[in-house]
Interface confidence: low
Amino acid sequence: EAYKSEIAHRYNDLGEEHFRGLVLVAFSQYLQQCPFEDHVKLAKEVTEFAKACAAEESGANCDKSLHTLFGDKLCTVASLRDKYGDMADCCEKQEPDRNECFLAHKDDNPGFPPLVAPEPDALCAAFQDNEQLFLGKYLYEIARRHPYFYAPELLYYAQQYKGVFAECCQAADKAACLGPKIEALREKVLLSSAKERFKCASLQKFGDRAFKAWSVARLSQRFPKADFAEISKVVTDLTKVHKECCHGDLLECADDRADLAKYMCENQDSISTKLKECCDKPVLEKSQCLAEVERDELPGDLPSLAADFVEDKEVCKNYQEAKDVFLGTFLYEYARRHPEYSVSLLLRLAKEYEATLEKCCATDDPPTCYAKVLDEFKPLVDEPQNLVKTNCELFEKLGEYGFQNALLVRYTKKAPQVSTPTLVEVSRKLGKVGTKCCKKPESERMSCAEDFLSVVLNRLCVLHEKTPVSERVTKCCSESLVNRRPCFSGLEVDETYVPKEFNAETFTFHADLCTLPEAEKQVKKQTALVELLKHKPKATDEQLKTVMGDFGAFVEKCCAAENKEGCFSEEGPKLVAAAQAALV
């Protein structure tokens, strides 16, 4: 349906509060360096304009596209050339090229310092003083750090954030109330950001088909009672929603997401028995609830997969007549029967099935050729199962920090050219898979672990794409979305790597290390471990264990010393010399 004024249509659909929030998020994701005040001003002006268009749709410029209106607004920012360099050249272009140009300048690693919460009393004063501005600052700070954050979900988290402050600012001990709640929300937000970045990468690097396949598998596991047509309808709508958000079309994205939630609630009888509770909630909570809803029970009477996909005489005919539909049906049927499999594994199985049909349907006797296709899946299923088992055993033995260090060693040896901060960040996140998934029951472990690993490895791919340094990382990242994790798992030590020259400065530590929070202390030690490996890539696990043990003892000793700085400058070089000798 065509509207006279697109901006008025979105303003009316979303309501003023959500509209303004989404505009603020959009601008913060595009112009990540601009101060908050500038973005508030831009969002206010756009919202006022939209309100005017809602009142009079034929007003001046109300008929312009959202890209034109938003782009024109971005291009009025005076400091564009100074702050963003060649991004200012985008303003020379016409739509849709101008928007594509802005999108291409989004920075996944803007390097802002981590958000440090001020004193609880100060926070609560700011919250009570101007709630709207306080929440706007939250949207801005998250959006500029995560330029692909799923905007409607960010509005939901801002609402949760508001709830935390409304409750805790009344508490006797504000700090005790805020601390754990803010930390729990922070974890959720970081995971949400990484998941959406993975979805955007799927769409941008591998196309709609990849994203749709991923969604078919995921939704078929979650809604096994829904038929394939229903799953396909939801997947098609969901793909549109994420394409819009990943493309910076946040108003359309939020509006379409609300429509999808409405559709699912109106058709819950044919989707899932678990949607009832979600559907009684207001729009933001409803969509979030539907996105996180628990899995429905399997229908009791599912026939064997073999009947339709192996034994049926028409397999090749059905496949060749409509390949995507036939493979989609296979994926749907397989996924709903296997909620314990990871989505990545299900997609690998579908790929294997497709390859088998391609090969067999070209032979004289296809049925004989593909008769054992389902049995041939066994190695593909065994591989992630064994991987999860082995790594969970290692995690249980070493704990999270030790497990992260084991992964740091593993990944630094696989790709020593990758920057140290990236190796540390990614290995720390990979290590969290143990905490997140290893305590789950056997039936949920693989799905939890492998799909989480896919999201974390996507972060590696995104960071590496910005400054490509390793051909093997590029290869694993770009050849196949579903085979990324097996590709990385399969990488051996990079024998072509030339060790880094020793730099004493890298291994010089100071007394400020002692006052750092535990997590930051770990990062410092892990940074040293990576640098050590880059200098001595042939070091054995035993040697590294010894050196890291000595390093831990050195930090402990100097942090307990009377003259901390003196201890670090005296003992540090001795430790480095001993480490070099131990790693010869």
Partner: nanobody, 124 residues
Framework: EVQLVESGGGVVQPGDSLRLSCAAS????????MGWFRQAPGKEREFVSA????????YYANSVKGRFTISRDNSKNTVYLQLNSLRPEDTALYYC?????????????????WGQGTLVTVSS
Amino acid sequence: EVQLVESGGGVVQPGDSLRLSCAASGGTFSTYVMGWFRQAPGKEREFVSAISQNSIHTYYANSVKGRFTISRDNSKNTVYLQLNSLRPEDTALYYCAASRFTSWYTADYEYDYWGQGTLVTVSS
């Protein structure tokens, strides 16, 4: 529906060069991975080279690495294959292919659309 038309084949001597072109119509060219495959008489079709949507990634079969170069011009909806230092074993029908989504660039079953082929004959 994407249509692909190859051109540039011909008869050349060992050591000579050729440039194959493949013009695409009917789809958004810049969203497709493009590949070249070849089939020699009596042999199976084999992968030659492929290029990602934005030209960042290129892939080559070992047998042509260093001799063949793939490139694309999204503004012209065309993908090219430059064939240098040709050998008699390069004689084949060369096909251009397009894929909306590919997990393995080298597998022909990943490609959704195919051209009719252009013949390259290397003979002294």
